[in-house]
Interface confidence: low
């Protein structure tokens, strides 16, 4: 790498992948192994992120860009740039500090992550319950009795029965 010749800031000519080395009379030196600089003119290279343990490498670090991590199977990313991995749960569960817990009666979660959400209240839209909700699925709302043509029989399903061994918390 050539010595930089900028009159204003001798470091401004150092390209990405290098740093302006004060210990070497401000020569542009390549980033050491396991470090990178994504922009020019940097006085140091940043340490590459290491995807270890519950993290795994999605993209290797290069001299100009940081490594990118995702999570090992059974975990999912949280936070900007997958800054943390959170344990997956089954559908019908949510993650608490004490591990995966079943959704309370009247709530559901159709994903392996996130929290249990209340079933849709069909009556708020003037509709009736067409298909009962479960821990894994929301209720399906059907047309309101008023929407049915005259003479058509409106069959309202029974109120959802509590699942065996699953009591509200």
């Amino acid at each position: 790498f050539e010595r930089t010749r900028s009159l204003q800031d001798p470091c401004s000519n150092c390209p990405a992948g290098t740093f302006c080395d004060n210990n070497r009379n401000q020569i542009c030196s390549p980033c050491p192994p396991n470090s990178f600089s994504s922009a020019g003119g940097q006085r140091t290279c940043d340490i590459c992120r290491q995807c270890k343990g519950v993290f795994r490498t999605r993209k290797e670090c290069s001299s100009t860009s940081n490594a990118e991590c995702d999570c090992t199977p059974g975990f999912h990313c949280l936070g900007a740039g997958c800054s943390m991995c959170e344990q997956d749960c089954k559908q019908g569960q949510e993650l608490t500090k004490k591990g995966c817990k079943d959704c309370c009666f009247g709530t559901f979660n159709d994903q392996k992550r996130g929290i249990c959400r209340p079933w849709t209240n069909c009556s708020l839209d003037g509709k009736s319950v067409l298909v009962n909700g479960t821990k894994e699925r929301d209720v399906v709302c059907g047309p309101s009795p008023a929407d049915l043509s005259p003479g058509a029989s409106s069959v309202t399903p029974p109120a959802p029965a509590r699942e065996p061994g699953h009591s509200p918390q």
């Epitope: 140091t44 940043d46 340490i47 290491q50 519950v54 800054s83 959170e86």
Partner: antibody, heavy 123, light 107 residues
Amino acid sequence: QVQLQQPGAELVRPGASVKLSCKASGYTFTSYWINWVKQRPGQGLEWIGNIFPSDSYTNYNQKFKDRAKLTVDKSSSTAYMQLSSPTSEDSAVYYCTRFGSSGYPDYYTMEYWGQGTSVTVSS
Amino acid sequence: DIQMTQSPASLSASVGETVTITCRASGNIDNYLAWYQQKQGKSPQLLVYNAKTLAEGVPSRFSGSGSGTEYSLKINSLQPEDFGSYHCQQYWTIPYTFGGGTKLEIK
């Protein structure tokens, strides 16, 4: 609850090797990294290395790589650190530690610590 | 290796005072920093991780802050049980490294 049990003290002759033990209980031993940390009297902490019991994969601090050997016995849920050719500089308390709950952001912080083994190197 | 420089090495304070301990990393550690408390003759205990998250059971008078290379631990309204040594640790990269420690004594 998670426990890491270490003997209280070991007396070792200079040049003779010493093998320190750390018996884990209260969790699945093979699922969490075990670290070893050195603390000389009145001084700071130094990370020696760690081992993943499931496959015995190890990482070492280069400073200790030649003289520390980390192993595990899965059948007894015990981690070991063997220190070869000890000198007076190795007289210290040695802690075994366990990383935090996998899947949470504290994964690489040392959430659980043994009581430490005080090693005295003396003739 | 990432060097961790902790200051001050020791300080004296009175119960009820507020103190701040700082830790400087030789490179960007992106908040991968933990603080530990150690009482005389005891093992260290985790206080703070991810630079600012309090470990379970840690009183709210403790707080962590910082980013990049500069981090600090603040203890508001010191209690008698807070006296002892404090250590910072980076877990951004292997080898994991600790600061030199800060001994907090009663004035």
